[in-house]
């Protein structure tokens, strides 16, 4: 069953009009794919390729499609029930805690610790410790060995942008 | 394969109401809206309204709100349509038809309702 | 209400020729255009969606176009079997609705 989005999760500017008391929940509502209009009788279209909703919606305007930023692949186009999926670039991933840029991939593990993880679109390598086998905090080290790794292939999104 | 199996010819008098169904197979009722539409001979099409089977959420064309009643009944994947006070404006065909929310991918074969006393 | 004109009710054409039936809006519908082939006693099937998105086993002869107010169904080499009513529906704001209509008839 769809996720509904109410009133109450929307911007002051967002939401529709008063509307008469709903006899279910989504009586009212858009389908994904759709906003309300402004008198709250009609579902208007979002348009292809510029805006999308995801959810039965009182929204009086779709959601604006996310374009991709340079470093960044289309790895699937913006629909208008689906945001674009952007995924950073081979040899680059997007942390959690950095979420609006794609970092570059350290190219090895710093000396005493060996490589457990390839670089993904959203992890950078992976090195543990020989001896303790316990991962490396993921600061960038003063010196590197010479020992490389090979990006990752992308797999799945790292983030949807929105 | 995707089916929409309509109920037969209806041939009722002036103020009564009839209730047509729509029986699915071959896909996820509760995935795809339903949509009913008129046809009356001769002429061209006219959306009546939509019913999600997935949260029943229905909408209606403002001309059919209160003249038509859509229903859902998961359990057996058929939709329904309840047309009350009958005249002979309302003598059509009604055609069943799934979808995505604005155009309709498959349809049923059609009931003809006869409104005549 | 959108309303949908079809300003042709009659084409007439031959097997082989190239046919366009169109269909103007009252207003812009931004692409959210469907057409439907309908034959005499039979149930109307859906070709095109969102103005150029040919449905599922619809032949590659038919192709949709058009933007803003202003559609196209075009029937590059037409085919006996394609005679029939061709309808135009806006998707784009409800209630949905459908053009008067086109008769394709085949020479």
């Known amino acids: 069953e769809s996720a509904l989005i109410t009133q109450q999760d929307l911007a002051p500017q967002q939401r529709a009009a008063p509307q008469q008391k709903r006899s279910s929940p989504s009586e009212g509502l858009c389908p994904p794919g759709h906003h309300i209009s402004e008198d709250g009788r009609d579902c208007i279209s979002c348009k292809y390729g510029q805006d999308y909703s995801t959810h039965w919606n009182d929204l009086l305007f779709c959601l604006r499609c996310t374009r991709c930023d340079s470093g960044e692949v289309e790895l699937s186009p913006c629909t208008t029930t689906r945001n674009t999926v952007c995924q950073c670039e081979e040899g680059t991933f997007r942390e959690e805690d950095s979420p609006e840029m794609c970092r570059k991939c350290r190219t090895g593990c710093p000396r005493g610790m060996v490589k457990v993880g390839d670089c993904t679109p959203w992890s950078d390598i992976e090195c543990v410790h020989k001896e303790s086998g316990t991962k490396h905090s993921g600061e960038v080290p003063a010196v590197e060995e010479t020992v490389t790794s090979s990006p990752g292939t992308p797999a799945s999104p790292c983030s949807l942008s929105g | 394969e995707v089916q929409l199996q309509q109920s037969g010819p209806e041939l009722v008098k002036p103020g009564a109401s009839v209730r047509m169904s729509c029986k699915a197979s071959?896909?996820?009722?509760?995935?795809?809206?339903i949509h009913w539409v008129k046809q009356r001979p001769g002429q061209g099409l006219e959306w009546i309204g939509w019913?999600?089977?997935?949260?029943?959420?229905?909408k209606y064309s403002e001309k059919f709100k209160g003249k038509a009643t859509l229903t859902a009944d998961k359990s057996s994947s058929t939709a329904y349509m309840q047309f009350s006070s009958l005249t002979s404006e309302d003598s059509a065909v009604y055609f069943c038809?799934?979808?995505?929310?604005?155009?309709?991918?498959?349809w049923g074969q059609g009931t003809t309702l006869t409104v005549s006393s | 209400d959108i309303v949908m004109t079809q300003s042709h009710k009659f084409m007439s054409t031959s097997v082989g020729d190239r046919v366009s039936i169109t269909c103007k809006a009252s207003?812009?519908?931004?692409?959210?255009v469907a057409w439907y082939q309908q034959k005499p006693g039979q149930s109307p099937r859906l070709l095109i969606y969102?103005?150029?998105t040919r449905h599922t086993g619809v032949p590659d002869r038919f192709t949709g176009s058009g933007s803003g107010t202003d559609y196209t169904l075009t029937i590059s080499s037409v085919q006996a079997e394609d005679q029939a009513l061709y309808y135009c529906?806006?998707?784009?704001?409800?209630?949905?609705?459908f053009g008067g209509g086109t008769k394709l008839e085949i020479k």
């Open positions: 019913i999600y089977p997935g949260n029943v959420n229905t």
């Open positions: 969102w103005a150029s």
């Open positions: 207003q812009d519908v931004s692409t959210a």
């Open positions: 038809a799934r979808g995505e929310a604005g155009y309709f991918d498959y």
């Open positions: 071959g896909y996820t009722f509760t995935s795809y809206f």
């Open positions: 529906q806006q998707h784009y704001r409800t209630p949905w609705t």
